[in-house]
């Protein structure tokens, strides 16, 4: 209808990187940009994804590096992490959330894709990272291992070959674990501390290095309360579990003192694995009972999983597995469960801003049913699993549903700020649900919408649109875009008009009648009023169209609700040559050429376009006649 | 050779002080225990206090807690026995006693014993 | 706290006499007890620790076993100089806490 499609600014990147994959106009003190999202960006080695901001009338578009942003006390991986893949801006304050949906950092042998976003200022710094599903991982740990160096142990080399291989099963890392080794005998040395080295090799490298200091007394109590009030005290971090491992070959020549030390060690949560070295005994034939029930005493509360005793120095190597299992007993999920919570969440798969925060998607949560997070200046909200089960049953579970497909919210009159929430594979058809979310980790489901067609995807793209501008939704349009008619991938956009409280299903928009693929839906825009008659408008991408060059479609808003024929189809053949996916992501909320009319910018494979609005004129024909 | 000598025993009135010392000669007092074991005149053995010399923790008989506290000086190889609030009751031979590993902790030396005597 | 019983409270026998005096733990309690003798006026002595352990310097007439929460301390063949007050102590395992019996007196026929 008025969008120029004669002179459109083809902004070019990265076809590799998926640039335009997302796009978002911004303003910064009347400049304006567009922010373009590229998930497949690389940033040295790794295919990061990144965020570039792009200035509109002419010039490069610069990358913001947000693919460098590192979390501390992690360790991370960024590879193939989809930054850009969302990106929502906040009008408020004209700063933007660019979502890494598949940042992943290391817990063990696992890799836990948590996903993380990065909040970027209105000038384009980074400010914060929004990470609401990380979580510690279950190896936050601080081990101290009291290894007894007096003269009685023989050989040392022994020693030292067990706490090597025991080192090497450690994971040891940002986030994960820290180990320090104090030696004790009369006396009692710190060999190395809890955050002198950072990495397997390191640790090794630093343990091989060991020498036994000797000695001819064996306080063990000595050894272990110095490790509590010391070794764990220098360099150990707040909230990780502590685990103390103690390597001694006789009875303590302090036992009288194990009682308090051990009741100190229990105050302060220090676990306790405790090896008995018989060794000694064995070579003198002597009876170990009393040296076993003082190690049994110091090894935490159940023996049969704190304790172990070994023959002789040399049989230390016989016990590294079944020791190391026993302290990572607690990897993989929490209590042992069979199923994931949060760990391969994948937040930030969308993004939609409120007043008092964001809503980021969570399509991996709860076994990939998904869920919907918040995060506020206050703090996190994360629903429980079973705050879903109204609309998501347990006989379910297994399917998929990938709840926070897509995230946006409504507003009523009667109920305020809901949320929605798409989950496109829901029981095959997919399904839409309107929520609150309230701070006990509980959800009121409103509503729900759902799909009519397997595979169609229905719920994967959700707009809301307030036609009118008086800050109450009039119309939810809901995408399915894979929704099959005609022997094709067609694409569909369901409308549901408020109804008082309840959003009423009043038909879909019409697209074009190719026989090709479209994929109508992808993508679904509430856009400020294009044609200026005062009602807000829509618009609609069709990425697949004319053979995967794309199509974008304007609606427009009138009275209250949403004309259902296009007004106008723009196709990428008609703007530029070579556009490719045209139509995968939509965003118009602001003049960009100070002409005082709302212009669009649109996604396509390896580009940004913006189009610009044309001025409509209104002419008012009258007809009189004279002589009357 | 191991040797402790008891000295600071007296005649001290109820709710008076006193302060006991065990020196050590032959052996570290920080590689062992020092206990306090007192003898009323005609009882038995009752055990007062003990003290970790290296790690100064310390036990006490629920009769002398919060009244008497024991302490060590492994410079000086000495250990103490601060009694206040003292009672009739307290009335005895204080002997220090050595507790350590080699004798499967049991009391190997004693001191000679110093008398205390609380009255008015 | 652990409570060592110690019975008799005195005895009368001769010289040659086989003499048994008992100790009872009021609960289980581990190896960990000795016997003293103690003569008037005198400090105690250490005879038996690790409840049959002989200390050095100690004639082998004295001997000590334990049969679950009894320990027992014979004399086989009392001497004269034999004729004292003997007590049994039970340490606490893993602190020094400890505890005494209430004393045997083996006094002469």
């Known amino acids: 209808f008025n969008m120029d499609t004669r002179k459109p600014r083809v902004i070019p990147g990265s076809r590799t990187a998926f640039f335009g994959y997302t796009v978002q106009q911004h303003d910064i003190s009347g400049n304006k940009w567009l922010v373009v999202g590229a998930p497949l960006e690389t940033n040295g080695y790794q295919k990061t994804g990144d965020v570039y901001k792009c200035p509109v009338i002419h010039g490069n578009c610069t990358k913001l590096n947000l693919g460098r942003v590192t979390l501390s006390n992690v360790s991370e991986r960024k590879d193939n992490m989809r930054l850009g893949l969302s990106l929502a801006t906040n009008p408020k304050d004209n700063s933007f959330l660019a979502c890494s949906p598949l940042w992943s950092h290391e817990c063990g042998s696992s890799y836990y894709t948590t996903g993380m976003c990065s909040r970027v200022n209105s000038n384009f710094r980074f400010s914060k990272t929004v990470a609401p599903a990380l979580q510690r991982c279950q190896t936050y740990m601080d081990i101290v291992i009291v290894l007894d160096g007096s003269n009685s142990i023989y050989p040392w080399v022994e020693v030292q070959h067990f706490l090597i291989n025991i080192l090497k099963k450690f994971y040891i890392g940002p986030g994960q674990i820290q180990v320090g080794v104090v030696q004790y005998g009369e006396d009692v040395v710190h060999e190395f501390h809890l955050n002198d080295y950072r990495s397997v090799k390191d640790v090794v490298e630093a343990a091989s290095h060991i020498e036994q200091r000797g000695g001819t007394e064996t306080r063990t109590a000595f050894g272990i309360e110095f490790a509590r009030s010391e070794a764990f005290q220098k360099g150990g971090r707040k909230g990780a579990k502590k685990v103390m491992i103690v390597i001694t070959d006789g009875e303590s020549h302090d036992s009288p003192d194990l009682e308090k030390v051990i009741q100190q060690s229990e105050r302060d949560n220090v676990t306790r694995y405790a090896v008995a070295v018989l060794g000694y005994y064995n070579r003198r034939g002597i009876n170990p009972e009393t040296f076993l029930n003082e190690i049994k005493y110091i090894a935490s509360d159940p023996d049969d999983k704190h304790f172990f005793n070994v023959t002789d120095e040399a049989a230390l190597k016989d016990i590294v597995d079944a020791l190391g299992d026993r302290i990572f007993s607690l990897e993989g999920t929490n209590k042992n469960e069979t199923s994931f919570g949060l760990e391969m969440s994948q937040t930030g798969f969308s993004s939609h801003v409120v007043e008092d925060g964001v809503l980021l998607g969570a399509v991996g949560a709860y076994d990939w049913n998904g869920a919907v997070l918040k995060e506020t200046s206050a703090g996190k909200v994360i629903p429980l699993r079973e705050s879903y089960l109204k609309e998501f049953p347990e006989e379910l579970k297994n399917h998929g549903a990938y709840l926070g497909y897509t995230v946006t919210s409504v507003v009523s009159s009667r109920q305020g700020r809901v949320y929605v929430a798409g989950a496109p594979r829901f029981n095959h058809t997919g399904k839409v649900i309107l929520f609150t979310m309230h701070n006990n980790r509980s959800l009121t489901i409103h509503q729900a919408m759902r799909g009519q067609q397997i595979g169609s995807y229905f719920g994967s793209e959700i707009t809301s649109v307030d036609i009118d501008g008086d800050g109450v939704t009039d119309v939810l349009l809901v995408g399915a875009p894979m929704y099959f008619n005609e022997g094709r991938e067609r694409g569909k956009v369901y409308v549901y008009e408020l109804r008082q409280n309840l959003f009423v299903y009043n038909g879909t928009l019409k697209d074009s009648h190719s026989y090709q693929n479209a994929r109508f839906g992808s993508s679904i825009a509430s856009v400020r009023d294009l044609n200026q008659d005062s009602y807000n408008d829509v618009v609609v991408g069709a990425p697949l169209e004319d053979n995967h060059a794309g199509a974008i479609y304007i609606f427009h808003g009138f009275r209250g609700s949403i004309l259902k024929t296009p007004k106008q189809r723009i196709t990428a053949s008609e703007l530029a040559t070579g556009l490719q996916y045209f139509g995968c992501s939509i965003h118009g909320q602001l003049d960009l050429n100070e002409d005082g009319l709302i212009d669009l910018a649109v996604g396509a494979l390896g580009n940004a376009v913006i189009l610009w609005s044309r001025p409509v004129v209104q002419i008012n024909a009258s007809l009189h006649f004279e002589p009357s | 050779e191991v040797q402790l000598v008891e000295s600071g025993g007296g005649l001290v009135q109820p709710g008076g002080s006193l302060r006991l010392s065990c020196a050590a000669s032959?052996?570290?007092?920080?590689?062992?225990?020092i206990h306090w074991v007192r003898q009323a005149p005609g009882k038995g053995l009752e055990w007062v206090a003990s003290?970790?010399?290296?790690?100064?923790?310390?036990y006490y008989a629920d009769s002398v807690k919060g009244r008497f506290t024991i302490s060590a000086d492994t410079s000086k190889n000495t250990a103490y026995l601060q009694m206040n609030s003292l009672r009739a009751e307290d009335t005895a031979v204080y002997y220090c006693?050595?507790?350590?590993?080699?004798?499967?902790?049991?009391?190997?030396?004693w001191g000679q014993g110093t008398l205390v005597t609380v009255s008015s | 706290d652990i409570q060592m019983t110690q019975s008799p409270s005195s005895l009368s026998a001769s010289v040659g006499d086989r003499v048994t005096i008992t100790c009872r733990a009021s609960?289980?309690?581990?190896?960990?007890v000795a016997w003293y003798q103690q003569k008037p006026g005198k400090a105690p002595k250490l005879l038996i620790y690790?409840?049959?352990s002989l200390y050095s310097g100690v004639p082998s007439r004295f001997s000590g076993s334990r049969s679950g929460t009894d320990f027992t301390l014979t004399i086989s063949s009392l001497q004269p100089e034999d004729f004292a007050t003997y007590y049994c102590?039970?340490?606490?395992?893993?602190?020094?806490?400890?505890?005494f019996g209430q004393g045997t007196k083996v006094e002469i026929k």
């Open positions: 102590q039970q340490s606490a395992p893993y602190s020094s806490l400890i505890t």
């Open positions: 003290i970790s010399s290296h790690s100064s923790y310390t």
């Open positions: 006693a050595r507790y350590w590993y080699q004798s499967a902790w049991a009391l190997d030396y």
């Open positions: 690790s409840a049959s």
């Open positions: 609960q289980s309690v581990s190896s960990a």
């Open positions: 032959g052996f570290n007092l920080y590689s062992s225990y």
